[in-house]
């Protein structure tokens, strides 16, 4: 069975060209979207960034693993891009747009 | 695989006295923690509390299924509760926990 | 009271197809995590599968050795829980077990008789 | 070869106590998980007999009791009897897929 790492943030770099996005985002051309992924699993040591729910639900989890899921692996903290696009009536508009950056993961 | 419903908040007590915690906490005897489960899958609706994060993540989990997971059903709102308890030194203690009740569950 | 009963075993050849059925009665079936457990003649008992309750969304499992010839479903309006073997092999011949999951600490605490499956040719 | 690790025989007088050992590993019993116990009398199914390391459904006697220690779980039989004689079962759950895992299974002998 696969075995999982732990908890952490995966860099990834988004191409807007591949969403299809191209013909309204300017720019930029792309960004460094980055991802959660790993286990959230006992013990939730301190780089997991657990919170007091997420050491709860593990707990029940390991005594009652087929009704209680494990927590999940999440973002933590998110950081806002900004993006120049045409808008439906094709004026350039230069907008902030937030949480579209992961920073860090944790277990929730 | 699995075919799971749309994330959302499940209902969950918890008995301290499962958790082997019944000697230190005094009071209460367990909580309604409730945890989050479900899938976050295209198209990421309202209900689902989605960041803008995991909306990209979603259209890219959707080109590269094998690379990048989708993002994860985790709480969105979490409450605290009061836990009367001893401490090292058997003083009783009563401490406000933060982030031990989800409210409310979205994807991320 | 809780019961489990198994039906559908039988003599099948290698390469066949096979359903097994397990009729649940004496509990709210929609609301358990319900397994398939086997037990080759004369071995130890052997994990198959499970299925989930609606609330999560009828999720399935499956052990390596049966991963893409079985299939787990259930029927909550029928209380019945179903196994479909596909493309069967010697090795499979057992007694399967359906077997309830009790919700607070995850035990089997309720098993069906069992039911005998021979693949032979 | 099952995940965890059982002696394939015990065995014991009336009136004695044996222990059933169930060796797992860190992603099984010492990756936190529940460990439970099951009798299967000849001829019958499986029947729980201990849940959580170490608790006893109604109608168990206390005679069974169960236990868990890092990646090791273990079962003891006190005042032994004969319709005690049965294969006994411990099972739990792989961390990685949260899959279930038994163990190989123990023929426990009442002698005499």
């Known amino acids: 069975s696969e075995l999982k790492t732990a908890c952490k943030k995966h860099e990834l770099y988004v191409s807007f060209q591949d969403l299809g996005w191209q013909d309204w985002i300017i720019a930029p051309k792309g960004y460094a979207a980055n991802y959660c992924d790993g286990e959230c699993s006992f013990p939730l040591n301190a780089h997991m960034n657990a919170t007091n729910h997420a050491i709860v639900q593990t707990l029940v989890h390991l005594m009652n693993p087929e009704y209680v899921p494990k927590p999940c692996c999440a973002p933590t903290k998110l950081n806002a891009i900004s993006v120049l696009y045409f808008d439906d009536n094709s004026n350039v508009i230069l907008k902030k747009y937030r949480n579209m950056v992961v920073r860090a993961c944790g277990c929730h | 695989s699995e075919l799971k419903t749309a994330c959302k908040k499940h209902e969950l007590y918890v008995s301290f006295q499962d958790l082997g915690w019944q000697d230190w906490i005094i009071a209460p005897k367990g909580y309604a923690a409730n945890y989050c489960d479900g899938e976050c899958s295209f198209p990421l609706n309202a209900h689902m509390n989605a960041t803008n994060h995991a909306i990209v993540q979603t259209l890219v989990h959707l080109m590269n299924p094998e690379y990048v997971p989708k993002p994860c059903c985790a709480p969105t709102k979490l409450n605290a509760i009061s836990v009367l308890y001893f401490d090292d030194n058997s003083n009783v203690i009563l401490k406000k926990y933060r982030n031990m009740v989800v409210r409310a569950c979205g994807c991320h | 009271q809780v019961q489990l009963v198994e039906s559908g075993g039988g003599l099948v050849k290698p390469g066949g197809s096979l359903r097994l059925s397990c009729a649940a009665s004496?509990?709210?079936?929609?609301?358990?995590?319900v397994h398939w457990v086997r037990q080759a003649p004369g071995k130890g008992l052997e994990w198959v599968g499970r299925?989930?309750?609606?609330?999560?969304?009828?999720?399935?499992s499956y052990a390596a050795p049966v991963k893409g010839r079985f299939t787990i479903s259930r029927d909550d309006s029928k209380n019945t829980l179903y196994l479909q073997m596909n493309s069967l092999k010697t090795e499979d011949t057992a007694v399967y077990y359906c077997a309830r999951v009790e919700r607070s600490k995850s035990g089997f605490d309720n098993w069906g008789q069992g039911t005998l499956v021979t693949v032979s040719s | 070869q099952s995940v965890l690790t059982q002696p394939p025989s015990v065995s014991g007088a009336p009136g004695q106590r044996v222990t059933i050992s169930c060796t797992g590993s860190?992603?099984?019993?010492?990756?936190?998980?529940?460990v439970h116990w099951y009798q299967q009398l000849p001829g019958t199914a499986p029947k729980l007999l201990i849940y959580g390391q170490s608790e006893r459904p109604s109608g168990v006697p206390d005679r069974f009791s169960g236990s868990k220690s890092g990646t090791s779980a273990s079962l003891a039989i006190t005042g032994l009897q004969a319709e005690d004689e049965a294969d006994y079962y411990c099972q739990s759950w792989d961390s990685s897929q949260t899959l279930v895992v038994f163990g190989g299974g123990t023929k426990l002998t009442v002698l005499g």
């Open positions: 860190s992603s099984n019993i010492g990756a936190g998980y529940s």
């Open positions: 004496g509990f709210t079936f929609s609301s358990y995590v």
């Open positions: 299925t989930r309750h609606s609330d999560m969304g009828y999720a399935t």
